[in-house]
């Protein structure tokens, strides 16, 4: 199904406009900002979601040490260019002709340049580390129960195949979720780890992208899991190219 047939809405993306103008009067939904048709049975790509967000009104030690090549999204929001499949174009530019290269999750992976900057290919982010800190609780969560709950969440809510959740680490109050997905592993129809991580990030912030679905209510054996900060690290199949100036 492309959208909920009974009331013509998109369950997986509230930032859409839907109407029964598809083949045979079927409900069809288009992303705000880009006008691209979206498949409402799965997650919408992060590129289209960012574009929609920018078009919307503004008021609307078992722990892993991230590698030296890990990227954090310090640039924040921008209005991206998406390809016809809804993926980020490798080169992004702003209105003042400043350009940079991004990875498959839209995070800058080079220094900023001008229109002459070349980005030969869209480099895949194959490893995402989601670093969470939970609010104080009476005691630590049972690691196995916490691990299973987060794996269930990614399967059920984000439709991410269980094979892509590589590990869940826990040292109270820090939780780390590792998502891994190589180009060769990702089959047609598989949710992209970058899209799942983005939906999760928005859920954690109380900004759910789902339509008509309650916000995220994470519980471990009935005990609420409340996240007070989130950091997401992105590792690309090819290390990023930044000048030494940025590293100092």
């Amino acid at each position: 199904h492309t959208a909920a047939q009974d009331n013509c809405t998109c369950p997986t993306n509230k930032m859409t406009v839907c109407s029964p103008d598809g083949p045979g009067g079927r409900c069809q939904c288009r992303a705000l900002g880009s006008g691209m048709a979206v498949d409402c049975s799965t997650l919408t790509s992060k590129c289209l979601l960012l574009k929609a967000r920018m078009s919307a009104p503004k008021n609307a030690r078992t722990l892993v040490r991230p590698s030296e090549h890990a990227l954090v999204d310090n640039d924040g929001l921008y209005d991206p260019d998406c390809d016809p499949e809804g993926r980020f174009k490798a080169r992004q530019c702003n209105q003042t002709s400043v350009c940079w290269c991004v990875n498959s999750v839209g995070v800058r992976r080079t220094d900023k340049g001008d229109l002459s900057l070349r980005c030969d290919e869209l480099v895949r982010t194959h490893h995402i580390l989601i670093d969470l800190r939970h609010r104080p609780t009476a005691g630590a969560f049972n690691h196995s129960d916490l691990d299973a709950e987060l794996r269930r969440l990614f399967r059920e809510r984000y439709r991410l195949h269980p094979k892509f959740v590589a590990a869940v680490h826990y040292e109270q109050p820090t939780i780390q979720i590792e998502l891994r997905q190589n180009t060769s592993q990702k089959a047609a129809g598989d949710v992209d780890i970058g899209d799942a991580a983005y939906y999760f990030e928005r859920d954690i912030k109380g900004e759910s992208l789902f339509q008509g679905r309650g916000g995220l209510d994470l519980r471990v054996r009935g005990e609420p899991l409340q996240v007070e900060r989130t950091l997401i690290y992105y590792l690309d199949e090819i290390p990023p190219k930044f000048s030494m100036k940025r590293l100092t």
Epitope: A148, R151, E156, R159, L160, H161, P162, K163, R213, R219
Partner: antibody
């Protein structure tokens, strides 16, 4: 072709343990989840728990916690469910089922466990 | 735990009849799953994500609903449809099933 083949019927005495096996074929074993569900004679379906085959992560329902053990042998693509301290109410057909982005997409044929003195 | 209550518990109908089975959740769930079980056999996935037919399931089966109220409809009963039907949720641990609806020949 995806297949889950379970071990044969068992008759056990109260207080004993039973170990049911579920041999998988037709898919990459460690990419999936195996859930266990039981059905008492003439009754409905009751979920016991599940094991993530790649990581070994396990979740048991509260009712069975402490009495059930789920394991997997990746070398033989076989999942196991052991239930201890058996009582007559544990008489049921026990099913294994594969999980992916669905809770259960393929099921084993079931194993009848009879607990009787 | 989320309780699922199916109604009716049993139902007699004839070939060609339209049949509706409802499943009510004790709290809101994201999606409902439906299974068909025949005597002596394992359950078979019928409908996932509330309304999507599993592979090989005839189009006479349909599912709908949201929140706490869901339905399974068989538009024109066929002889092979006489079985027991279960709804199931996995929006939160533990996964739970409805008590089942036994569909019998009138």
């Amino acid at each position: 072709e995806v297949q889950l083949v379970q071990s044969g019927p068992e008759v056990k005495k109260p207080g004993a343990s039973v170990k049911v096996s579920c041999k998988a074929s037709g898919f990459t074993f460690t990419d999936y989840v195996i859930g266990w569900v039981r059905q008492a004679p003439g009754q409905g379906l009751e979920w016991i728990g599940e094991i993530y085959l790649g990581s070994g992560t396990i979740y048991y329902t509260q009712k069975f916690k402490g009495r059930v053990t789920m394991t997997a042998d990746t070398s033989t693509s076989t999942a196991y469910m052991e239930l201890s301290s058996l009582r007559s109410e544990d008489t049921a057909v026990y099913y294994c089922a594969r999980g992916s982005i669905f809770p259960f997409d393929y099921w084993g044929q079931g194993t009848l466990v009879t607990v009787s003195s | 735990d989320i309780q699922l209550t199916q109604s009716p518990s049993s139902l007699s109908a004839s070939v060609g009849d339209r049949v509706t089975i409802t499943c009510r959740a004790s709290s809101s769930v994201s999606y409902m799953y439906w299974y068909q079980q025949k005597p002596g056999k394992a359950p078979k996935l019928l409908i996932y994500d509330t309304s999507t037919l599993a592979s090989g399931v005839p189009s006479r089966f349909s599912g709908s609903g949201s929140g706490t109220d869901f339905t399974l409809t068989i538009s024109s009963l066929q002889p092979e449809d006489f079985a027991t039907y279960y709804c199931q949720q996995w929006s939160s641990y533990p996964y739970t099933f409805g008590q089942g609806t036994k569909l019998e020949i009138k």
